[in-house]
């Protein structure tokens, strides 16, 4: 088999063998090496010499195999846009951001650019759990049987109704989706409106 061409090598059809790590240089009609993440082109390739790469300066990065002659400026996560930092910028990776707690991504352009406050879920509901935090606004779902949630909140979870017997008490009023069971001491009289149901 023929030996694999090593950059720089001639290319008649303007395409290179390894699209990720090589690029077509039209002036010389050759394929040259791209620079790896964390580096940039310090000297362009020629017919007899491949691309020379150098490490990105402090406060800058290049994320991909590239033929940039400069690196990108590290930028912070913008708190006014509701973003917070989860990992600082390195020479190979831009600052990693996510939505602040209680927020979701409202604008996406390759990455999240703007977060907004999650909507409240009303009493009797809770936010459906998502695979990824901050990915979308709340979708409120009713509490399942035997559970309640009594606030308007973006994050409150439905809780199981109190079982009065577990506490040595008896049920005075049943729980609903919006309120917990009301318990009372078994020796206490029932409220007047319920006394007619008792055997004398």
């Amino acid at each position: 088999s023929q030996p694999q061409a090593v950059p720089p090598y001639a290319s008649e059809n303007q395409t290179c063998r390894d699209q990720e790590k090589e690029y077509y240089e039209p002036q010389h009609r050759i394929c040259c090496s791209r620079c790896p993440p964390g580096t940039y082109v310090s000297a362009k390739c020629s017919r007899i010499r491949d691309t020379v790469c150098a490490t990105c300066a402090e406060n800058s990065y290049n994320e991909h195999w590239n033929y940039l002659t400069i690196c990108q400026l590290c930028r912070p996560c913008d708190p006014v846009m509701g973003l917070e930092e989860i990992a600082p910028c390195t020479s190979k990776r831009k600052t990693q951001c996510r939505c602040q707690p209680g927020m979701f991504c409202a604008a996406w352009a390759l990455e999240c650019t703007h977060c907004e406050l999650l909507s409240d879920c009303p009493p009797g509901t809770e936010a459906e759990l998502k695979d990824e935090v901050g990915k979308g606004n709340n979708h409120c779902v009713p509490c399942k049987a035997g559970h309640f949630q009594n606030t308007s909140s973006p994050s409150a979870r439905c809780q199981p109704h109190t079982r009065c017997e577990n506490q040595g008490l008896v049920e005075a009023a049943p729980g609903t989706a919006q309120s917990d069971t009301t318990c009372k001491n078994p020796l206490e009289p029932l409220p007047p409106e319920m006394s007619g149901t008792m055997l004398m």
Epitope: N59, Q72, P88
Partner: antibody, heavy 120, light 113 residues
Framework: QVQLVQSGAEVKKPGSSVKVSCKAS????????ISWVRQAPGQGLEWMGG????????NYAQKFQGRVTITADKSTSTAYMELSSLRSEDTAVYYC?????????????WGQGTTVTVSS | DIVMTQSPDSLAVSLGERATINCKSS????????????LAWYQQKPGQPPKLLIY???TRESGVPDRFSGSGSGTDFTLTISSLQAEDVAVYYC?????????FGQGTKVEIK
């Protein structure tokens, strides 16, 4: 030495469009973000948007979104700014500018400016 | 967008005297991970494009006379001309590059008293 040379002055009617060019020389055009900044008579500087030619991605100030289009032609090392639905308030000097230390850092190099007059 | 506010709007200073221009940003432009302030100062003379004077809030661009200095951090910044010269008559602008949506102050006009 990096130079940004802009197209000549334009006089336009309200409601029409203008396209201003910015030709770069003396540096690697495609690796630097080109910004467009305008200055109305007697007013301050206002960033309109920018483009990174090698990525082909443009980003615009909210104020101009939908009315401005920024493009770049890597083969001629030229960036373009087109502003549509012109009104008298768009009368200004339009500058292109680019960084030198970083792909998208502070603006070191500026074009000479293009005067656009919008008048009926 | 980050709003930049300069004070005063104009300033008249005698030759050889100190001129001080203030700039306030609506949010911090300090990036805690690298402890750098993403703020630049520009000088613009009539009929000319702006000229970069200072970046990273306090680093002078090469060729800029050392009478120009920048200071401040977070949201409050100052440009100082220690001894005003006739050629310093111009409008001065602060600008943030903390976000890729650059914004400028409204400008401060410096004149000779």
């Amino acid at each position: 030495q990096v130079q940004l040379v802009q197209s000549g002055a334009e006089v336009k009617k309200p409601g029409s469009s203008v396209k201003v060019s910015c030709k770069a020389s003396g540096g690697t055009f495609s690796s630097y973000a080109i910004s467009w900044v305008r200055q109305a008579p007697g007013q301050g500087l206002e960033w309109m948007g920018g483009i990174i030619p090698i990525f082909g991605t443009a980003n615009y100030a909210q104020k101009f979104q939908g009315r401005v289009t920024i493009t770049a032609d890597k083969s001629t090392s030229t960036a373009y700014m087109e502003l549509s639905s012109l009104r008298s308030e768009d009368t200004a000097v339009y500058y292109c500018a680019r960084p030198s230390y970083y792909l998208d850092g502070w603006l070191d190099y500026w074009g000479q400016g293009t005067t656009v007059t919008v008048s009926s | 967008d980050i709003v930049m506010t300069q004070s005063p709007d104009s300033l008249a200073v005698s030759l050889g005297e100190r001129a001080t221009i203030n700039c306030k940003s609506s949010q911090s432009v300090l990036y805690s991970s690298n402890n750098k302030n993403y703020l630049a100062w520009y000088q613009q003379k009539p009929g000319q494009p702006p000229k970069l004077l200072i970046y990273w809030a306090s680093t002078r661009e090469s060729g800029v006379p050392d009478r120009f200095s920048g200071s401040g951090s977070g949201t409050d910044f100052t440009l100082t001309i220690s001894s005003l010269q006739a050629e310093d008559v111009a409008v001065y602008y602060c600008s943030q590059y903390y976000t890729t949506h650059y914004t400028f102050g409204q400008g401060t006009k410096v004149e000779i008293k």
